[in-house]
C-alpha cells in the first residue's frame, strides 16, 4: 500500500503491463499522454509477460513488491515523510 | 516520488545486459525460480524491442516520474 502511494501511476502501468491487460495499459498510458510509438513499446513488454504465462507474472510482481518494500525504498519513504513534516512545520 | 531502487530495476530491465538485470534482482529475491524468470523476461524484451522501442519505453517512464500522479 505504502509503495503505491509514492508513485501510483507507476504501479498502475507496471501492473497493467504484467497483468497482460491491453485495455488497462492503454488507460494507464493515456494518463501520462503516451504517444503511439511509446504505447507500441510498452505493448511489446506486455507481450513478454503474456507469452510467459501466469507464473511469470506472479514472480515478477513478487520482485517488484519486494524491491518496493525493501529497506532501500522504505528508508527513502520515511526520509521523504520526515522532510515533508519539516517543511509543513516550517511552513506554519 | 518513485524509489531509486525501483527506478534502477526498471532501467536495467530495459538497457542493461541480462546478467546485470539478474544480478540486480538477486539483491532482493535470490530464489532460483525468480532469477530464471527474470532472465527469461529480460531475454524476451531484448529479442522484441528495438533500440528505439527501448528509448520510447524510457520516455514513458520519464513521463510517469514527472507526472502529478507520481
Amino acid at each position: 500500500v505504502k509503495m503505491a502511494e509514492t508513485c501510483p501511476i507507476f504501479y498502475d502501468v507496471f501492473f497493467a503491463v504484467a497483468n497482460g491487460n491491453e485495455l488497462l495499459l492503454d488507460l494507464s498510458l493515456t494518463k501520462v499522454n503516451a504517444t503511439e510509438p511509446e504505447r507500441t513499446a510498452m505493448k511489446k513488454i506486455q507481450d513478454c509477460y503474456v507469452e510467459n504465462g501466469l507464473i511469470s507474472r506472479v514472480l515478477d510482481g513478487l520482485v517488484m513488491t519486494t524491491i518496493s518494500s525493501s529497506k532501500d525504498c522504505m528508508g527513502e519513504a520515511v526520509q521523504n515523510t520526515v522532510e515533508d513534516l519539516k517543511l509543513n512545520t516550517l511552513g506554519r | 516520488e518513485i524509489c531509486p531502487a525501483v527506478k534502477r530495476d526498471v532501467d536495467l530491465f530495459l538497457t542493461g545486459t541480462p546478467d546485470e538485470y539478474v544480478e540486480q534482482v538477486a539483491q532482493y529475491k535470490a530464489l532460483p525460480v525468480v532469477l530464471e524468470n527474470a532472465r527469461i523476461l529480460k531475454n524476451c524484451v531484448d529479442a522484441k524491442m528495438t533500440e528505439e522501442d527501448k528509448e520510447n519505453a524510457l520516455s514513458v517512464l520519464d513521463k510517469i516520474y514527472t507526472s502529478p500522479l507520481c
Epitope: P37, D47 | C44, A47, K48, T50, E51, E52, D53, K54
Partner: antibody, heavy 121, light 113 residues
Framework: QVQLQQSGPGLVKSSQTLSLTCAIS??????????WNWIRQSPSRGLEWLGR?????????DYAVSVKSRININPDTSKNHFSLQLNSVTPEDTAVYFC???????????WGQGTLVTVSS | DIVMTQSPDSLAMSLGERATINCKSS????????????LGWYQQKPGQPPKLLIY???TRESGVPDRISGSGSGTDFTLTISSLQAEDVAVYYC?????????FGGGTKVEIK
C-alpha cells in the same frame, strides 16, 4: 547460403495495388533473429526503406511514415516467403524494389535481385 | 528520421590511390547502452542490389577485402579504400539502423580516372 528471389509484375496501373513476393531459401521467415525488409530505389528518392516484418513469438511490423497508410508486409510461413502490398500507387512509386534480410533489425546482409516496377498513368 | 549526408557525390581516382568517402548523420547513431555505432556501408554495382561491406561502423563483412575499412563515431563516419582497384568502381552508401526507420545516404560514385 541465404538467397532471396523476388517475383511480381513489372507494370502496375496508377491507383492499383503493387504486389511483390520474396521467396527465402537458406533461412526461415519465422527465424527469431532476423527481420525481412522491403526497400526501393529511384533516381529521385535514392534508397528508401519501406518496412519490415519479424517474428519474436508473434509477428511484428514496422513501416516508413511515408507509406504507412497504404503498405502491408505479410509473411507466409507455409511458403517461406514474405510479400509487399502497396495500395493506391502513383507514378512516383515507380522504382526498383528490393527485399532484404536484416540481422535482428540492423544491417541488411542479404538482398533480392531487385524488381523494376513501373506505374503507368 | 535521421538524415544521412554523404560527400563527395562522386570521386575519380587513379588505380592504387586512396579513396575516402564521408558520411554525416543528423543525429548521433552511437547507442550509449552498448557503445556501438549503428552504421553500415554498402557497395552497389550497376544492375545489382547493394552489397553489405561494413557494419557497426568498422566491422568488415566476411569476404570483403581488407583494403576497405570503416571508421568514425557519433555523427561522422568514413569509408576508406586504401588502394583503389578496378573492381571497386561502384556507388557506395552509408545507412543508419539505430532508428526503426532505416535511412540511407545519397550515395558516392567512385570511378577510375
Amino acid at each position: 547460403q541465404v538467397q532471396l528471389q523476388q517475383s511480381g509484375p513489372g507494370l502496375v496501373k496508377s491507383s492499383q495495388t503493387l504486389s511483390l513476393t520474396c521467396a527465402i531459401s537458406g533461412d526461415s521467415v519465422s527465424s527469431n533473429s532476423v527481420a525481412w525488409n522491403w526497400i526501393r530505389q529511384s533516381p529521385s528518392r535514392g534508397l528508401e526503406w519501406l518496412g519490415r516484418t519479424y517474428y519474436r513469438s508473434k509477428w511484428y511490423n514496422d513501416y516508413a511514415v511515408s507509406v504507412k497508410s497504404r503498405i502491408n508486409i505479410n509473411p507466409d510461413t507455409s511458403k517461406n516467403h514474405f510479400s509487399l502490398q502497396l495500395n493506391s500507387v502513383t507514378p512516383e512509386d515507380t522504382a526498383v524494389y528490393f527485399c532484404a534480410r536484416a540481422w535482428n533489425w540492423y544491417y541488411l546482409d542479404y538482398w533480392g535481385q531487385g524488381t523494376l516496377v513501373t506505374v503507368s498513368s | 528520421d535521421i538524415v544521412m549526408t554523404q560527400s563527395p557525390d562522386s570521386l575519380a581516382m587513379s588505380l592504387g590511390e586512396r579513396a575516402t568517402i564521408n558520411c554525416k548523420s543528423s543525429q548521433s547513431v552511437l547507442y550509449s547502452s552498448n557503445n556501438k555505432n549503428y552504421l553500415g556501408w554498402y557497395q552497389q554495382k550497376p544492375g545489382q542490389p547493394p552489397k553489405l561491406l561494413i557494419y557497426w561502423a568498422s566491422t568488415r563483412e566476411s569476404g570483403v577485402p581488407d583494403r576497405i575499412s570503416g571508421s568514425g563515431s557519433g555523427t561522422d563516419f568514413t569509408l576508406t579504400i586504401s588502394s583503389l582497384q578496378a573492381e571497386d568502381v561502384a556507388v557506395y552508401y552509408c545507412q543508419q539502423y539505430l532508428r526503426n526507420t532505416l535511412t540511407f545516404g545519397g550515395g558516392t560514385k567512385v570511378e577510375i580516372k
